[in-house]
Amino acid sequence: RPSFSLVEDTTLEPEEPPTKYQISQPEVYVAAPGESLEVRCLLKDAAVISWTKDGVHLGPNNRTVLIGEYLQIKGATPRDSGLYACTASRTVDSETWYFMVNVTDAISSGDDEDDTDGAEDFVSENSNNKRAPYWTNTEKMEKRLHAVPAANTVKFRCPAGGNPMPTMRWLKNGKEFKQEHRIGGYKVRNQHWSLIMESVVPSDKGNYTCVVENEYGSINHTYHLDVVERSPHRPILQAGLPANASTVVGGDVEFVCKVYSDAQPHIQWIKHVEKNGSKYGPDGLPYLKVLKHSGINSSNAEVLALFNVTEADAGEYICKVSNYIGQANQSAWLTVLPKQQAPGREKEITASPDYLE
């Protein structure tokens, strides 16, 4: 039965304007069942770090160890798969870093990064200095294990030099990699020493070896590709948002709710209210009022702005997000102070979030 009584009757999901909220591609860590996994929170100057999994707070237990900026999962199981986030709370702000964990029989880790192609990788040699092939940018080759979601584009690079200029060819699982080996083929950009595969599928999984050679020698480097398939997921809300806020009577304030959802989300801002002097209905459920929801006539539903607040505006504000899969909600409290008792910061306004494509 419902956990609240709505003061205003609203349908769960009215028609939405054509916006797309989407998870920006997080790094993917892949572990085999039974393995241990350690991830370092890639945020700087973190005073306090909190962790979430699929939007739910993550605490230490007999298999999960949280030490400083490190998360350790011992004896991983498929249930450990999901979207993780670490939030670094600082004195003035907070920042969140997202990553995927995929516990699967495939061995792989990391994610492909979209390097900016640059001809700086194409090194010309003095024609007199004969030289066997050598790597010119090993930093771009450090990540050997790449795990990417299906339908993404993958780029492997082997920037090299030599004299005469070496040639590059690619092997898949130790055999010549031919265009007909995959639907849609692949691209080789010799100028950038790269192999590009668009819209990867599970059959693209395997070892990819670049062989760079000239008449004075041959070098090679192998990457492992894992293609991670996906399941529909309910909305995920950024940890720590909306954030508690305080302002004086007559002040303005904004609450921000950052939503991650592949599917169209419906956002509602809800507040506990009183009706006929009571906070609860005859059924014992609290009265709630929908202040704002995403829809045709609603701009930037991720932000709730309150202007010229009164003491009656104080209380809990809930950001409730639903899609066709399920729901998620997080709340924050507004404290309204008398005008003479100004807080440290009169207005606590969080910057409007980016829309992630």
């Epitope: 419902p2 769960l12 939405e16 054509p18 339908a151 529909p232 169209q264 066709y324 399920g326 729901q327």
Partner: antibody
Framework: QAQLVQSGAEVKKPGASVKVSCKAS????????MHWVRQAPGQGLEWIGL????????SYNQKFRGRATLTVDTSTSTAYMELSSLRSEDTAVYYC???????WGQGTLVTVSS | DIQMTQSPSSLSASVGDRVTITCKAS??????VAWYQQKPGKSPKLLMF???YRYTGVPSRFSGSGSGTDFTLTISSLQPEDFATYYC?????????FGQGTKLEIK
């Protein structure tokens, strides 16, 4: 691995009501919407509505609003779909499906005949 | 309500063929489209969601594309087990509507 098991076939008279159950196992029942979809013999799929077991929120296809009632019993991880004022054109297989339509029940045939 | 119009309504093809089924929404649904496969007497099975995401365990010969109002499901090389009825569905706004189905038969 989630699994949805539905109640057995029903034969009803016009004007009567039917209540179909859908028992979930293997996943967090309260974390996903439960959809109800029907399919008349030889026809396509038609969405009836959804319920979110976490708080009881419902959304109905306007076509079924007032006749269909979706409820859940979280203690048994069971969802229910009740359809009242049955008519012959309600004869169909009724399916429950988890949030992302990634898991479906086996279907329940409801026959409305005088 | 958003109407989903599928074409063709039926299709005959042979094993090994490349097959494309299209679905047109009556208004823009961004990429909020799913595809299902259904065999006689069985429940539908999810193939694709969010237009182009292949659901876990679905063979790579299935692919989906499109955004806005026009969507396609492609089977790159038909296998015997692929002969079934296919439905598109929009999961953009309620009521979540389905296409009328495409029956894929052996030629």
């Amino acid at each position: 691995q989630a699994q949805l098991v539905q109640s057995g076939a029903e034969v009803k008279k016009p004007g009567a009501s039917v209540k179909v159950s859908c028992k979930a196992s293997g996943s967090t029942f309260t974390s996903y919407n439960m959809h109800w979809v029907r399919q008349a013999p030889g026809q396509g799929l038609e969405w009836i509505g959804l319920i979110y077991p976490g708080n009881g929120d419902t959304s109905y296809n306007q076509k079924f609003r007032g006749r269909a009632t979706l409820t859940v019993d979280t203690s048994t991880s069971t969802a229910y779909m009740e359809l009242s004022s049955l008519r012959s054109e309600d004869t169909a297989v009724y399916y429950c499906a988890r949030g992302g339509f990634d898991y479906w029940g086996q279907g329940t045939l409801v026959t409305v005949s005088s | 309500d958003i109407q989903m119009t599928q074409s063709p309504s039926s299709l005959s093809a042979s094993v090994g063929d490349r097959v494309t089924i299209t679905c047109k929404a009556s208004q823009g649904v961004t990429t909020n489209v799913a595809w299902y496969q259904q065999k006689p007497g069985k429940s539908p099975k999810l193939l694709m969601f969010s237009a182009s995401y292949r659901y876990t365990g679905v063979p790579s010969r299935f692919s989906g594309s499109g955004s806005g109002t026009d969507f396609t499901l492609t089977i790159s090389s038909l296998q015997p087990e692929d002969f079934a009825t296919y439905y598109c569905q929009q999961h953009y706004s309620t009521p979540y509507t389905f296409g009328q189905g495409t029956k894929l038969e052996i030629k």
